[in-house]
């Protein structure tokens, strides 16, 4: 599989800043590793869309990691 | 209103350089990938090459590796392909898009970008 140049991170860029709340599957958080030195949050879409980076700066995406993080602690 | 603009296409040889400019308009330059795609006579659009725009990351398809080099002026909103060695299979209209949000394992897939520019023909005569 080729590589980027520049680590191991899943998502290309910074990400979109929102995704329908209605279009949203599920939400994943992929915390810095050795792999990837940032946060990384992957939406996968409804109805076999297939996969966004969600950009996690932004106000969607912090309100999801704190709603993953209130489930997971 | 977005707009991507390619240009540089042309006819020559086999062996021979191509650069091809893919001008965007209309959108933040750095929030979005430009990938350049392809697409021959009878076959499928297929992906040749990715740069991100806000870290310069680069993607190559295994049959363009070694020979084309893509790379951005983000002052000037243009990415631009360098295409050495040129071979008859190269032969295509290659379109320039732009994806936001994309994961690295669908970095070169059609289906994952939002807007397209119009193509520009390349020819490789033998």
């Known amino acids: 599989f080729p590589m980027f140049k520049r680590g191991r991170c899943l998502c290309i860029g910074p990400g979109v800043k929102a995704v329908k709340v209605a279009d949203i599957e599920k939400a994943s958080i992929m915390y810095p590793s050795n792999n990837c030195d940032k946060i990384e949050v992957i939406i996968t879409l409804k109805e076999n869309k297939g996969q966004r980076c969600l950009n996690p700066k932004s106000k969607q995406a912090r309100l999801i990691i704190k709603k993953v993080e209130r489930k997971n602690f | 209103e977005v707009q991507l603009v390619e240009s540089g296409g042309g006819l020559v040889q086999a062996g021979g350089s191509l650069r091809l400019s893919c001008a965007a308009s209309?959108?933040?330059?750095?929030?979005?990938?430009i990938g350049w795609f392809r697409q021959a006579p009878g076959k499928e659009r297929e992906g040749v090459s990715l740069?991100?725009?806000?870290?310069?990351?680069?993607y190559y398809a295994d049959s363009v590796k070694g020979r084309f080099t893509i790379s951005s002026d983000n002052a000037k909103n243009t990415v631009y392909l360098q295409m050495n060695s040129l071979k008859p299979e190269d032969t295509a209209v290659y379109y320039c898009?732009?994806?936001?949000?994309?994961?690295?394992?669908?970095?070169?897939?059609?289906?994952?970008?939002?807007?397209w520019g119009q193509g520009t023909q390349v020819t490789v005569s033998s």
């Open positions: 898009a732009a994806g936001q949000g994309l994961l690295r394992a669908q970095a070169l897939r059609w289906e994952s970008y939002d807007y």
């Open positions: 209309g959108f933040s330059f750095d929030d979005y990938a």
């Open positions: 740069i991100s725009s806000s870290d310069g990351s680069t």
